[in-house]
Amino acid sequence: GCLTQLYENAFFRGGDVASMYTPNAQYCQMRCTFHPRCLLFSFLPASSINDMEKRFGCFLKDSVTGTLPKVHRTGAVSGHSLKQCGHQISACHRDIYKGVDMRGVNFNVSKVSSVEECQKRCTSNIRCQFFSYATQTFHKAEYRNNCLLKYSPGGTPTAIKVLSNVESGFSLKPCALSEIGCHMNIFQHLAFSDVDVARVLTPDAFVCRTICTYHPNCLFFTFYTNVWKIESQRNVCLLKTSESGTPSSSTPQENTISGYSLLTCKRTLPEPCHSKIYPGVDFGGEELNVTFVKGVNVCQETCTKMIRCQFFTYSLLPEDCKEEKCKCFLRLSMDGSPTRIAYGTQGSSGYSLRLCNTGDNSVCTTKTSTR
Amino acid sequence: IVGGTNSSWGEWPWQVSLQVKLTAQRHLCGGSLIGHQWVLTAAHCFDGLPLQDVWRIYSGILNLSDITKDTPFSQIKEIIIHQNYKVSEGNHDIALIKLQAPLNYTEFQKPICLPSKGDTSTIYTNCWVTGWGFSKEKGEIQNILQKVNIPLVTNEECQKRYQDYKITQRMVCAGYKEGGKDACKGDSGGPLVCKHNGMWRLVGITSWGEGCARREQPGVYTKVAEYMDWILEKTQSSDGKAQMQSPA
């Protein structure tokens, strides 16, 4: 289920799957929510530790049991991923952090009159992931009112420093507030060039596009279909970026599909989950559990309820069935995508709906002069 | 909202505008989306007005002037007014609206979390009131959704300021000693939300006050935590499964 409570002065021991710098526990929790394997997190605010390297440290953790031992650590904040938390799942993070400089690659500097305007500029720049703004009272006069637009390889700051009269924050593109707009078109038989930032296996171009949308550095993608001439590249989804923000070239290519991230869409973003079920397809991955269930939809529900499950295969092979129930293979991988996609099998595959934000957890777990 | 500022898109995605279309159409109250098909508001919003037919509920909007005849709206399937609410009394000023069709959640339209039942231990220090109501006592409905940061006031302090009225444990008050920032007419039914541990919770429903933003006259809100049993009971679906779960 959904667990929203935070544990003050507590740190989860072990289970690390990733670490990064984040300005607060809530942003750390959001990164945990969107990480394919993270179930728990621990965050070290600046006040909690003397080690400059670990200040603002966000540690993403996994556990086979879903829990880890807590150790007392003054100032630390720990908690759970919000996977399975329905409408609370959002990559949107509006907070502005005063007295904090989030470091990264500074690719644009301009003078603006307020931190809100700086955030707006970041939101309206295709490459900007976060920003820092030097206020009117910054100690160096020449830097006052400077708005620095930034990015980093992982989408989070490469370092976070306490610095007076500096305010930092993140792009509001995940809030569907970008003024850039987006390309909804999917281009059949076209391959985009430029830099690959990641490679995953997906059953179709739409899953590829959603993964691109929620990847911090993906601006566009090319997907190689299951009939692509090179067998080892079938169902490969290449997540891409470029200096300009658009593909520098595209090549006509049979059995490829290309498109753009939808992160810059105005007013509506795709859900960060994939609800379609793929008949005749087998998703390979690390086995989490095998259970007998009645029907593929129940298999998907079972996967969704088991928080570590990322995807599943429901087998209809006679040897995998007894009476009306068949085997439901619950699986996971390092990146949340299948490690192998096979066609022509007797069965169906699909993904966990744990990141769907339309879940029915409508409310969180945890007279005189009338107006 | 008196002394407030403009909100931005998606900042308060649970805020809805309850509008009435008799001869003309007008905004009357705020409300809070608490589920795909449920809105929580104040009972007094329905005083003197028909139930169901004439109401239009707009969600996922920021600027009332953007509403046209083509703007989608929700209609009411059922209005559940608290059984102990009495017109012109401040007590039990709470009502649930069941929408005719469930709403999809987006970044601009999603529910607010409800507090734990009888939540008394949490100390809320970051509370906001939002609405399209008057910006002064004899004002007019605002176009852009307004927001204002207001501190909670203890019930003891609030009772001192309202000696002619009974401030019950099922009410919560918010305001500045010096006044200047408050909810006002047209904000009724809307949310008083507080951010705690990074999560927004619906602490109050805008209900009443002496004038608006007057010195030493805090706003009085229906305390949502005190009505959790009622909310959960009324939002049970026909198959007995709760449409929403209260915090553990």
């Epitope: 002069s369 | 008799l22 009357l28 003197g48 007005l49 028909p50 004038g211």
Partner: antibody, heavy 122, light 106 residues
């Protein structure tokens, strides 16, 4: 066009009863708060009672509380005033009016009937 | 249940501005409506929500309300404006009328 037509007035003895009716047309009756206002001969207007659109809430002036009952039948577009224990001081022209009411703007009556005379005398 | 007080009579010369007052405790906090009633006729709404005019009412009629007094003003008064005028307010479920003012156009 909004029309309100009162009926049921007449001469009645003190302590007697009378039922006034108000037939409404030209608007969606079930959407509006309805009100009775009276005017004694040569005197000013005095509010008597009003009723919410659904009939779920009713309000009375102190002078008639416990003696008069307001009601409505939305299927017949009709408003009623049942008057019991009538007194000489209840003698007046009784007007039925359509009320515009909400908690923001309060109450006012934008359409009035022609009135029906009630005389309480022995 | 506070009372609303109006002067019994107001006289005005044709073409002049007539001002009829209505006073009550904290009346400025409430919204006031004004009704015109000519002999033998039903009352007619001329001002609502302090200052608003129904579409059929001429612009000569205006209203204001602050502190403890609401005022109905009729500019360029004409003979046909001669009537009784009533103020009305709403307070905690109670409808309150003023005692009425007879406007005489001299």
């Amino acid at each position: 066009e909004v029309q309100l037509l009162e009926s049921g007035g007449g001469l009645v003895q003190p302590g007697g009863s009378l039922r006034l009716s108000c037939a409404a047309s030209g608007f969606t009756f079930s959407w509006y708060t309805m009100v009775w206002v009276r005017q004694a001969p040569g005197k000013g207007l005095e509010w008597v009672s009003y009723i919410y659109p659904s009939g779920g809430a009713t309000f009375y002036a102190d002078s008639v509380k416990g003696r008069f009952t307001i009601s409505r039948d939305n299927s017949k577009n009709t408003l009623y005033l049942q008057m019991n224990s009538l007194r000489a001081e209840d003698t007046a022209v009784y007007y039925c009016a359509m009320g515009s009411y909400d908690y923001i703007w309060g109450f006012y009556s934008d359409h009035w009937g022609q009135g029906t005379l009630v005389t309480v005398s022995s | 249940q506070s009372a609303l007080t109006q002067p019994p009579t107001v006289s005005v010369s044709p073409g002049q501005t007539a001002r009829i007052t209505c006073s009550g405790n904290k009346l400025g906090d409430k919204y006031v409506a004004w009704y015109q009633q000519k002999p033998g006729q039903s009352p007619m709404l001329v001002i609502y929500q302090d200052t608003k005019r129904p579409s059929a009412i001429p612009e000569r009629f205006s209203g204001s309300n602050s502190a403890n007094t609401a005022t109905l003003s009729i500019s360029g008064t004409q003979a046909l404006d001669e009537a009784d005028y009533y103020c009305q307010a709403w307070d905690s479920s109670i409808v309150i009328f003023g005692g009425g003012t007879r406007l005489t156009v001299l």
